[in-house]
Interface confidence: low
Amino acid sequence: LRLLDHRALVCSQPGLNCTVKNSTCLDDSWIHPRNLTPSSPKDLQIQLHFAHTQQGDLFPVAHIEWTLQTDASILYLEGAELSVLQLNTNERLCVRFEFLSKLRHHHRRWRFTFSHFVVDPDQEYEVTVHHLPKPIPDGDPNHQSKNFLVPDCEHARMKVTTPCMSSGSLWDPNITVETLEAHQLRVSFTLWNESTHYQILLTSFPHMENHSCFEHMHHIPAPRPEEFHQRSNVTLTLRNLKGCCRHQVQIQPFFSSCLNDCLRHSATVSCPEMPDTPEPIPDYMPLW
């Protein structure tokens, strides 16, 4: 988790002088509780936006937006703590909006936004906005949380972001797999425009079962430049096992930008259809 281009982040708006600060996610008001604390944020919204860095890279960011409740507690509102928790790693990153002037009621509802948390493809986050100061131990909670799921690199807009392109999202291998005679599979795919090696991972399964009955790995050496974007054809020999008929072919590239952590592509060959044997017609109606 990180912030996009930690340049001058602004939270000021007409009628409010505000600064954005790094936060340890442990606001001082936890340790020194105040008697009067503001109410919670209203209508917290998190959306996927895209932002360029100063270097021109494109990243997905969480666009966080919320409004204030129209009650007198805004007189005691000193700021807000924004927290983003990545659910699969428990990594948390926080920033603090510090209000440098008192808030006043005005004709429009106060609205705040922040779009600098960089998020990763295919990850889920919990976004929390805490109004400051935080409540006393038995006080009413004054925060709002929402979960936010970022699409993976298959998503059209995500595909062209820097993290997705770095993991090989622009490569479309267009895999085809056909079953040949004598227990063989012919795998064909389009090479990318990089002189790097590939691995074909074959896993076979019995019909309707998920434990494998055969596994095989095939190494494809790095193509020469004249072979870029050409089709590579590989014939794999299967084990002659009755019923080991469903085959998953996975192609793992080793691009320089993602090494052994590049996006993999796969194709599956189903078991051949069994010829229908006519069933005897029962002379009673089954009860299931």
Epitope: Q45, I46, Q47, E65, V119, K146, F148, L149, P151, H155
Partner: nanobody
Framework: QVQLVESGGGLVQPGRSLTLSCTAS????????MHWVRQPPGGGLEWVAG????????GYADSVKGRFTISRDNAKKSLYLQMNSLRSEDTALYYC????????????????WGQGTMVTVSS
């Protein structure tokens, strides 16, 4: 322009099923999460269900979990809501809504809404 058109509503008896459809036009349907939101007569808006851009992630309100199924067909630019075991409290105007690109959007942030289709559950 961006448009969402719902269909499939009607009068149905409690315990029966109904499928709502929503057809989208004017935007790249497969880029966005989609949602169903309902409004009972005289009541406020209630989020019902949402589905991510590729259909891999779905979410439901507790009140419909296990009874309703949301799905989408990106090729047909269509969103569906299969409603089983309908109850009288499911009576509402059902709206299809375009969400954000990530899931987790609040109904207030839905940028486009349909006109709604009325579902009445009564014996």
């Amino acid at each position: 322009q961006v448009q969402l058109v719902e269909s499939g509503g009607g009068l149905v008896q409690p315990g029966r099923s109904l499928t709502l459809s929503c057809t989208a036009s004017g935007f790249t349907f497969h880029d966005y999460a989609m949602h169903w939101v309902r409004q009972p007569p005289g009541g406020g808006l209630e989020w019902v269900a949402g589905v991510s851009w590729n259909g891999n992630n779905v979410g439901y309100a507790d009140s419909v979990k296990g009874r309703f199924t949301i799905s989408r067909d990106n090729a047909k630019k269509s969103l569906y809501l299969q409603m089983n075991s309908l109850r009288s409290e499911d009576t509402a105007l059902y709206y299809c809504a375009k969400g954000g690109m990530g899931s987790g959007s609040h109904p207030d942030s839905f940028s486009t809404w349909g006109q709604g289709t009325m579902v009445t559950v009564s014996s």
